[in-house]
Interface confidence: low
């Protein structure tokens, strides 16, 4: 049974793209009425508890640390809040993905990342980031350095033996400026990624302001 409580919030304290054997902190935004916060991972449509925190009012929002990240720990996470013993509320889901070589080595090759029309653009222009690989890829992910929000994910297109995805940033704003990387993934485990592409720096500069 769900009470009339606000939708809780879940976030990764750092990037949700985590290197193999790395760690990440997940924060479950507190609900005043909740006495217990549980972090769950959703695997094969079933919930598995990762941790739980008894909530005391003077404490900060409950945090959970996921250590030694691997393919088993990658996936969709949710915070579950107990309000009365029989009442609970779920947050949105947070996707955690892990980068690194999988045992079969099918993700060994890094993709390449390029930008059109130019890595230096003015606000309001249309920019496309192109992620490519010569190896079988089902989806590409694009992440921005320092961003805690989920990476963009696109299904790959097969173009003359190249697998690619075009990420459109249109129209660009100053918020789009930063360092981007892209990753390959296979449908067998969409939360397991290749090593990243070389970083690509996108500069969004307002030339009229500079002049």
């Amino acid at each position: 049974q769900e009470g009339d409580f606000p939708m809780p919030f879940i976030s990764a304290k750092s990037s949700p793209v985590i290197p193999l054997d790395g760690s990440v902190k997940i924060q479950c935004q507190a609900i005043r009425e909740a006495y217990l916060t549980q972090l769950m991972i959703i695997k094969n449509s079933t919930y598995r508890e990762i941790g739980r925190r008894l909530k005391f009012w003077n404490e900060t929002d409950p945090e959970f640390v996921i250590d030694h990240m691997d393919a088993n720990k990658a996936g969709r996470y949710q915070c579950q809040y107990r309000i009365g013993h029989y009442r609970f509320r779920y947050s949105d889901t947070l996707e955690l993905v892990v980068t690194g070589e999988e045992p079969a080595g099918r993700l060994r090759d890094r993709p390449s990342l390029s930008v059109r029309p130019s890595p230096s653009v003015a606000p309001g222009e249309n920019v496309t980031l192109l992620c490519q690989s010569g190896n079988r890829t089902d989806t590409f992910l694009l992440s921005k350095e320092g961003a805690a929000h989920r990476p963009l994910r696109l299904r790959s297109q097969d173009q003359d033996g190249w697998y690619q995805a075009e990420f459109s940033l249109s129209p660009v704003t100053s918020a789009h400026g930063g360092t981007y990387r892209c990753y390959r993934s296979l449908s067998t485990n969409p939360y397991l990624l290749s090593q990243p592409s070389e970083p690509l720096a996108l500069l969004v500069a307002d030339y009229t302001m500079q002049n």
Epitope: Y35, E49, R52, L54, Q80, G84, H85
Partner: antibody, heavy 122, light 112 residues
Framework: QIQLVQSGPELKKPGETVKISCKAS????????MNWVKQAPGKGLKWMAW????????THTDDFKGRFVFSLETSASTAYLQINNLKNEDTATYFC???????????????WGQGTTLTVSS | DVVMTQTPLTLSVTIGQPASMSCKSS???????????LNWLLQRPGQSPKSLIY???KQDSGVPDRFTGSGSGTDFTLKISRVEAEDLGVYYC?????????FGGGTKLEIK
């Protein structure tokens, strides 16, 4: 060790009020829920309410609304069951039981008080 | 409410012999947190209930090894490998997964 000690037997007349206490010891009172369970003579167990000892919020069944008041004195690690306007059918043994809340499987274990026998008779 | 059905109503067993009783729930007791809140109690004559098993199969402290709980979903079993005189009383199963918490009607264990 964990103990729940309840107040002694009560003999009351219909229309009167009774307040039964349950004093907990051996654990952090706020970290575990408290339940009240009724057992009429020769009958089975019937769950009445669960109290979130952290917030003081009771969750009870429709059968135990109105005349039944579930409260806490957290500083004394004590839970109370008060029944107003007593009726003959309230004659029963009332148990408090620690269960629920908590951060480990320990919260799923149940510990029971010795019971308080209430007799309502004119 | 979730209905808990215990069978048999009465169990007559000779000291030293095994005993088995069943508890069935009208809905699955697997909670959203992955746990199954199904416990077993023993109420000896004139005494308060005493916890035997919690979370389907976990023995409470001080409970003899001859008591074992098993089951999942809606079907649960309590077994006593060798009945002793102190085991007589009424055994209750109860669930805490769904609101409200409900008890089975009990199985009375008698000594032959």
């Amino acid at each position: 060790q964990i103990q729940l000690v309840q107040s002694g037997p009560e003999l009351k007349k219909p229309g009167e009020t009774v307040k039964i206490s349950c004093k907990a010891s051996g654990y952090t009172f706020k970290n575990y829920g408290m339940n009240w369970v009724k057992q009429a003579p020769g009958k089975g167990l019937k769950w009445m309410a669960w109290i979130n000892t952290y917030t003081g919020e009771p969750t009870h069944t429709d059968d135990f609304k109105g005349r039944f008041v579930f409260s806490l004195e957290t500083s004394a690690s004590t839970a109370y069951l008060q029944i107003n306007n007593l009726k003959n059918e309230d004659t029963a043994t009332y148990f408090c039981a620690r269960w629920g809340l908590g951060t480990t499987e320990e919260a799923a274990r149940d510990y029971w008080g010795q019971g308080t026998t209430l007799t309502v008779s004119s | 409410d979730v209905v808990m059905t215990q069978t048999p109503l009465t169990l007559s067993v000779t000291i030293g012999q095994p005993a088995s009783m069943s508890c069935k729930s009208s809905q699955s007791l697997l909670d959203s947190d992955g746990k199954t809140y199904l416990n077993w109690l023993l109420q000896r004559p004139g005494q308060s209930p005493k916890s035997l098993i919690y979370l389907v199969s976990k023995q409470d402290s001080g409970v003899p090894d001859r008591f074992t709980g098993s089951g999942s979903g809606t079907d649960f079993t309590l077994k006593i490998s060798r009945v002793e005189a102190e085991d007589l009383g009424v055994y209750y199963c109860w669930q805490g997964t769904h609101f409200p918490q409900t008890f089975g009607g009990g199985t009375k264990l008698e000594i032959k």
